[in-house]
């Protein structure tokens, strides 16, 4: 089965790489614009230059193209704790990231929030914090993992998942209560 091509891909596939088919005359292949530029006017004829103009400040194109407008530069989302790693240039979008000792959590494909890496207090670091993943902690005896923090088993309620990890402690607490009833 031949995959379905969009109109634009169909038009481009008729021309050699680095060229696109003239929208008004499908016998003409025009040279695409370099990254950092956009299409101002199609080439007037075969072998003639495409009129490409440089992107204005605040916009970019990151690859060769025949776009009528440059793309708007992304803005880092301060409300999500993001910081600018590198600013937008005519041929590269803004790069956003997180501060030192933070990691990115992606809520969706194009939205991330910065959170502090867990320090594994009352536990040990099993896996170090990475760009897109929090520290993985292993808790000391008498502690269980809740929301990636090691919490004392004294905070473990019987209905919670922690009961398996804290079972000896819970039994001990029950035992002392029982012994006090004699």
């Amino acid at each position: 089965l031949v995959p379905h091509l969009g109109d634009r891909e169909k038009r481009d596939s008729v021309c050699p790489q680095g060229k696109y088919i003239h929208p008004q005359n499908n016998s003409i292949c025009c040279t695409k614009c370099h990254k950092g530029t956009y299409l101002y006017n199609d080439c007037p004829g075969p072998g003639q230059d495409t009129d490409c103009r440089e992107c204005e400040s605040g916009s970019f194109t990151a690859s060769e193209n025949h776009l009528r407008h440059c793309l708007s530069c992304s803005k880092c989302r301060k409300e999500m704790g993001q910081v600018e790693i590198s600013s937008c240039t005519v041929d590269r979008d803004t790069v956003c990231g997180c501060r030192k000792n933070q990691y990115r959590h992606y809520w969706s494909e194009n939205l991330f929030q910065c959170f502090n890496c867990s320090l594994c207090l009352n536990g040990t670091v099993h896996l170090s914090c990475q760009e897109k993943q929090n520290t993985v902690c292993t808790c000391h005896a008498g502690f269980f993992l809740r929301e990636n923090e090691c919490v004392s088993c004294s905070n473990c309620k019987k209905s919670l998942e922690c009961t398996k990890l804290c079972l000896p402690q819970i039994e001990n607490v029950k035992g002392t209560e029982d012994s006090g009833t004699t």
């Epitope: 301060k78 409300e79 929030q113």
Partner: nanobody, 119 residues
Framework: EVQLLESGGGLVQPGGSLRLSCAAS????????MVWVRQAPGKGLEWVSH????????YYADSVEGRFTISRDNSKNTLYLQMNSLRAEDTAVYYC????????????WGQGTLVTVSS
């Protein structure tokens, strides 16, 4: 005690509009970024939109961009979601939430309001 109470959901025809509200109490509303998320039947949570503390910066998922508008009234401690040109795929339970601070989970969110888009 933090409380978030959504309202405004209901049954609407494709192409129709609804305005969701979220009444907040128990915390300083103006100090928090607020979020709308939704859960379609049998699916996971989807981030719909969020708005910064002063209502200046907003974000929309690609699926709702140009159709939904988030806003807030800090004097009324209320968050809104204006939903226009509704589609069948917008059918979901809509929740308002406070943007998490400690980690990627929601400490505070409402009970949700059901939006059904059907002819």
């Amino acid at each position: 005690e933090v409380q978030l109470l959504e309202s405004g959901g209901g049954l609407v025809q494709p192409g129709g509009s609804l305005r969701l509200s979220c009444a907040a109490s128990g915390f300083t509303f103006a100090h928090d970024v607020m979020v709308w998320v939704r859960q379609a039947p049998g699916k996971g949570l989807e981030w719909v939109s969020h708005i910064d503390r002063v209502g200046q910066d907003t974000y929309y998922a690609d699926s709702v961009e140009g159709r939904f508008t988030i806003s807030r009234d800090n004097s009324k401690n209320t968050l809104y979601l204006q939903m226009n040109s509704l589609r069948a795929e917008d059918t979901a339970v809509y929740y308002c939430a406070v943007l998490p601070k400690r980690g990627p989970w929601f400490d505070y969110w409402g009970q949700g309001t059901l939006v059904t888009v059907s002819s």
